[in-house]
Amino acid sequence: DPASKSRSCGEVRQIYGAKGFSLSDVPQAEISGEHLRICPQGYTCCTSEMEENLANRSHAELETALRDSSRVLQAMLATQLRSFDDHFQHLLNDSERTLQATFPGAFGELYTQNARAFRDLYSELRLYYRGANLHLEETLAEFWARLLERLFKQLHPQLLLPDDYLDCLGKQAEALRPFGEAPRELRLRATRAFVAARSFVQGLGVASDVVRKVAQVPLGPECSRAVMKLVYCAHCLGVPGARPCPDYCRNVLKGCLANQADLDAEWRNLLDSMVLITDKFWGTSGVESVIGSVHTWLAEAINALQDNRDTLTAKVIQGCGNPKVNPQGPGPEEKRRRGKLAPRERPPSGTLEKLVSEAKAQLRDVQDFWISLPGTLCSEKMALSTASDDRCWNGMARGRYLPEVMGDGLANQINNPEVEVDITKPDMTIRQQIMQLKIMTNRLRSAYNGNDVDFQDASDDGSGSGSGDGCLDDLCSRKVSRKSSSSRTPLTHALPGLSEQEGQKTS
């Protein structure tokens, strides 16, 4: 007889023991349930201690299920981040390797005496991409200024060029356009490309960070009670075979995860913005085309300077006066050979297209992560009833679950029959993460328009915690920011694991 089997508490004993609890706690037969604090107070197989143990266990199980779901999402975002980051860094490293391999032959000492300047430029581009707080346009402008100074000295070894003369040369530079169109073109294209690449990768970092932080938000005591009632009270009340009614489960988890669901709107905005910015990865100003071809703009610039040398010198003398000549110095340098240019457009490798299409698909898949979480957990982790509605566990007994399913988010839980939710007290950690999502979305939208938003300024917006032949062979003309006093520190969302210190290397 099933009723007598239930009354003997055998099934409860089995389930309770399987969870690792001591069987000595379990009564042999049902007892009166006045002592129960969470489950309905009918006849029961659960003592107070059992109820407390099962309540703690159900709480822990839900937190584990939540963390598991979050971990899957985090892993996906981390894999995406790594893939894109590897690809973008590879493009820049390839460009630098090509420069180091081809420039000595193409430009001789015009390159070797200034190799340090080029190395520094690539280092700064790397730092910028990784999220350092430096101004890319200024970095490029200073690079060209230093390079002009060094190359001008190299091209005129017979002249005495003291600091004040070089200062004058620097002031004339913008009007003289000594490097032709290359600096302007590189500035326009590189700014757009690097801003797009770095903001996309930072977006993945922020998304992952948000998921990690939200997964650590503890479930409140009201949620714990409701989850116990949902999962284990049927056992205590002698109907261990009854599985939770689907709508009942949804209401419990919508109440428990009300704050998390409030991430939905800004989460969608962020993912939409990330998908949108991938449009900027293509074309002549696209990430692949530009980041992989920095060296060709540099080659073009040196060629332009050589072609314009005589005109440039005449204009500099006109603006800055006749410099003194070193009587022991040689004559002016012979015109050097033009560096042979590699084609500017890198043929697309197909790698980026594949990465982008995978990313778009995966980002679309997780767009409704936060609002679908209650449904997902109910169907995947809670062993819901598939029986007809009147045979499932409704929190009181086996039978139909009548209340309507609540809407998503905190405000909609005002009348949640299963979890008492104080809608006037939103969770502060989750509010902070909503702010982080907003900030990153704004950054991506600016990046889409080719603008860089100072990341540190942005992250102060509200949340608190968001989630460094001119002379020496390859020494001269080092582009290091003179004008900007900003110290180049990693930002709130500089790429995870890529701190500024990684820039350290020895030549």
Epitope: D120, C471, L472, L475, S486
Partner: antibody
């Protein structure tokens, strides 16, 4: 005005390490390379290496490469030079020196830090 | 490595004398040559950069010349404060190297 202030004198045992600091002020710290030059008692000047405070990139004199590490802290505008496996011949005054304008010309020098290596 | 050879290693002069110090590089260094003065117990001070450019604030009695491998520092009329050690330094290639120094003493 540009100032480079170095840490105080140190006495070390052979085999130990020493870390000398150089705090910069009066200019944009990330704007100029910083070099380290040493001078043994009664001897000439010897270049040890340099660091780009903006990127952290370093170039060392091959002679010291295995033992020297140069780092920087942009938040305090300070560069550091650490020399390990000290021997008696490392007894010297260690100077930090800032470049003039990206050209290997040392226009500004720290006051020097005497490091004595003795058992 | 580029060797820098200074001569003489020391010299004696009286106030008002003209003093010439030479520096020879083991290979062509164009005009990437700098001169420093070091007084006892003090840090070196830049005098001349780029072989012949006078650093701001340095008296005009100091001058530099040369190109390629041979360079000269001249003090046209030595003053009491000029008695010190002088070093040349090449800034053409790594490692940066200094000459052995020339000590200018009072006769």
């Amino acid at each position: 005005q540009v100032q480079l202030v170095q840490s105080g004198a140190e006495v070390k045992k052979p085999g130990a390490s020493v870390k000398v600091s150089c705090k910069a002020s009066g200019y944009t710290f990330t704007g100029y390379y910083m070099h380290w030059v040493r001078q043994a008692p009664g001897q000439g000047l010897e270049w040890m290496g340099e660091i780009n405070p903006s990127t952290g990139d370093t170039t060392y004199n091959q002679k010291f490469k295995a033992r020297v590490t140069m780092t920087r802290d942009t938040s305090t505008s300070t560069v550091y030079m650490e020399l390990s496996s000290l021997r008696s011949e490392d007894t010297a005054v260690y100077y930090c020196a800032r470049e003039k304008r990206d050209d290997g010309v040392f226009a500004y020098w720290g006051q020097g830090t005497l490091v004595t290596v003795s058992s | 490595n580029i060797q820098m050879t200074q001569s003489p290693s020391s010299l004696s002069a009286s106030v008002g004398d003209r003093v010439t110090i030479t520096c020879q590089a083991s290979q062509d260094i164009s005009n990437y040559l700098n001169w420093y003065q070091q007084r006892p117990g003090k840090a070196p001070q830049l005098l001349i950069y780029g072989a012949s450019n006078l650093e701001r604030g340095v008296p005009s009695r100091f001058s530099g010349s040369g190109f390629g491998t041979d360079f000269t520092l001249t003090i046209s009329s030595v003053q009491p404060e000029d008695f010190a050690t002088y070093y040349c330094q090449q800034a053409k290639s790594y490692p940066l190297t200094f000459g052995g120094g020339t000590k200018v003493e009072i006769k």
